[in-house]
């Protein structure tokens, strides 16, 4: 099978801030990482040459090489292996199974961990770790999570031609190599492809002593996958609802904030939310939608499907989401902008996943939309 995803993930790890352009003093290092990436893709050519992912990588490398004036010849880089803070006591022997169980090791030096929740669903709507709720454009590839333990990158594509409303068509999760617990593992989901295994075919963390502290479970074939990363106290839920993907995570605050470079790495969406210029004011959209004559300019999409009048959208969303919270409002927004009834389910499952993953049940329903960055 084609292993181009391994090249992609190694490049992603080596350039740590992922989709962001390097600062000028990082360019030589970035170019070295690009040359390594190019070498990796060349090695996979025999088994990947017929696949889109391979050609996308090759063209992407060429584009980045020219953008950053990288020479084809020159030094290459090793994927960066960060010194990760231990999950438990620094005195703890690394071959102890406890190091691979976050809660057990956490209790040694603190009270019970505080858990936080982030979710991305629909058009897309983002619930951040700080319980801010935003509707975003974020077309293309964006870092959802980027900390010392894992990277999550989403790719969002327009729901309709020319629309500012996008939805998640691809999701890549990289669990970084961690002590005696797990090897680096990559999970990649795309539209119509929700695997029940990591990219290398495995279902756990590899060959290390604590490999079972990372496990992938298929809940519903092709529709619902759960990944348990016990060594960092993290649960991830990935679903395919209709054509698009949803993401939800439960993660301890300590892990959320485990970033080396707050200025660059801390910019990920689950932590900081979407940049202001990427946010859609769906409250204003809703106000326009409720008025009898709906102006087209109110919509983030130039094509407003006529399949769902406002009343129908409200009825359909009420069916699944009786509480008129922001999940309900997101549902109405999505039906009005896309005409795709599957977005009702996306909002419903996002709320259900929130119920399972959010530590504070009182904060589950959000009623006030916060547009500012936290």
């Amino acid at each position: 099978p084609c292993k181009i995803l391994k090249c992609n993930s190694e490049f992603w790890s080596a350039t740590s801030s992922g989709s962001h352009a390097p600062a000028s003093d990082d360019v030589p290092e970035f170019c070295a990482a690009l040359r390594t990436y190019a070498l990796c893709t060349r090695r996979t050519a025999r088994t990947c040459r017929g696949d889109l992912a391979y050609h996308s990588a090759v063209h992407g490398i060429e584009d980045l090489m020219s953008q950053h004036n990288c020479s084809k010849d020159g030094p290459t880089s090793q994927p960066r292996v960060r010194t990760l803070p231990p999950a438990g006591d620094s005195q703890e022997r690394s071959d102890s199974p406890e190091i691979c169980h976050y809660e057990k090791s956490f209790h040694k030096h603190s009270a019970a961990p505080n858990y936080t929740h982030c979710g991305l669903f629909g058009d897309p709507h983002l619930r951040t770790f700080t319980d801010h709720f935003q509707t975003c454009k974020v077309q293309g590839a964006w870092p959802l999570i980027d900390n010392n333990y894992l990277n999550v990158q989403v790719t969002n594509t327009p729901v309709l031609p020319g629309s500012a409303a996008t939805a998640t068509s691809k999701l890549t999760i990289i669990f970084k190599n961690f002590q005696e617990c797990v090897d680096q593992k990559v999970y990649q989901a795309e539209m119509d492809e929700l695997p029940s295994a990591f990219a290398d075919g495995s279902k756990n963390g590899g060959d290390k002593h604590g490999a079972n502290s990372l496990k992938i479970t298929e809940k519903v074939s092709g529709q619902h996958v759960e990944i348990q990363a016990k060594y960092i106290g993290t649960t991830i839920v990935v679903r395919q609802v209709g054509r698009y993907l949803t993401f939800a995570v439960r993660m301890p605050e300590e892990v959320v904030n485990a970033v080396e470079d707050r200025d660059s790495q801390g910019l990920y969406l689950c932590l900081r939310g979407c940049p202001l210029n990427q946010q859609i004011d769906f409250q204003a959209f809703r106000a326009n939608a409720e008025s009898p004559r709906r102006p087209a300019a109110a919509s983030p999409s130039p094509v407003v499907p006529e399949t769902f009048p406002y009343e129908t959208a409200v009825a359909k969303c009420k069916e699944k989401l009786p509480v008129e919270d922001l999940y309900y409002q997101a549902c109405v927004f999505d039906l009005l902008t896309t005409g795709d009834v599957n977005f009702t389910l996306a909002a419903y499952y996002a709320l259900e996943d929130g119920k399972m993953l959010h530590s504070n049940k009182d904060k589950l329903h959000l009623f006030e939309r916060t547009r500012e960055l936290p």
Epitope: P1, C2, R46, T47, C48, D51, L52, E190, G222
Partner: antibody, heavy 115, light 112 residues
Framework: EVQLVESGGGLVQPGSSLKLSCVAS????????MNWIRQAPKKGLEWIGM????????HYADSVKGRFTISRDNSKNTLYLEMNSLRSEDTAIYYC????????WGQGVMVTVSS | DVVLTQTPVSLSVTLGDQASMSCRSS???????????LEWFLQKPGQSPQLLIY???NRFSGVPDRFIGSGSGTDFTLKISRVEPEDLGVYYC?????????FGSGTKLEIK
């Protein structure tokens, strides 16, 4: 779950033509190269050829070059194998398989070339 | 074209025992920096082939760890550490390093 279903096989006379189809589901068909492989009765496997995800390149085994043509319609999630100037030695089960190098295979379709 | 020669042609083993088969290539299958595109397939009776091992030694999704691939250059081996009833069938090696892609002639595994 990856599924590949071949169809279009049957009994034909030497020198005639036949077009096989392979309908794919359970993965993003338009992202992957695809292969055709065949297996003569009681014999081993023989690679016939492959096509890139966007049809930009096709590669064939010498035994079928100039006679067989691989094509695809990504909008229909379908891979095709057009076989001309068929010979008795083309009698085989024909499999389509996903990937630049095959990982998942269809159940196969029988083609018999006989007078 | 690269010729893959598989030995033995057939192999009869007792359940629970180890089985070992060989695949020899007419030229090196190393492609680049140690990447070698040699795969093993199993074709169970009446079924289509299924991928077991890729890049010499990597088990494909869902393949039990009793299947162990090894080798380099021109000599490759597939071992089954404890043969189970569902392992019977014909094992084919396959190379993707050189065009055209080629299969070995197969090793038939039978249960004693």
């Amino acid at each position: 779950e990856v599924q590949l279903v071949e169809s279009g096989g049957g009994l034909v006379q030497p020198g005639s033509s036949l077009k096989l189809s392979c309908v794919a589901s359970g993965f993003t068909f338009s992202n992957y190269g695809m292969n055709w492989i065949r297996q003569a009765p009681k014999k081993g496997l023989e690679w016939i050829g492959m096509i890139y995800y966007d049809s930009s390149e096709k590669h064939y085994a010498d035994s079928v070059k100039g006679r067989f043509t691989i094509s695809r319609d990504n909008s229909k999630n379908t891979l095709y194998l057009e076989m001309n100037s068929l010979r008795s030695e083309d009698t085989a089960i024909y499999y389509c398989a996903k990937g630049t190098t095959p990982d998942y295979w269809g159940q196969g379709v029988m083609v018999t070339v006989s007078s | 074209d690269v010729v893959l020669t598989q030995t033995p042609v057939s192999l009869s083993v007792t359940l629970g025992d180890q089985a070992s088969m060989s695949c020899r290539s007419s030229q090196s299958l190393e492609y680049s920096d140690g990447y070698t595109f040699l795969e093993w397939f199993l074709q169970k009776p009446g079924q289509s082939p299924q991928l077991l091992i890729y890049e010499v030694s990597n088990r494909f999704s869902g393949v039990p760890d009793r299947f162990i691939g090894s080798g380099s250059g021109t000599d490759f081996t597939l071992k089954i550490s404890r043969v189970e009833p569902e392992d019977l069938g014909v094992y084919y090696c396959f190379q993707a390093t050189h065009d055209p892609l080629t299969f070995g002639s197969g090793t038939k595994l039978e249960i004693k």
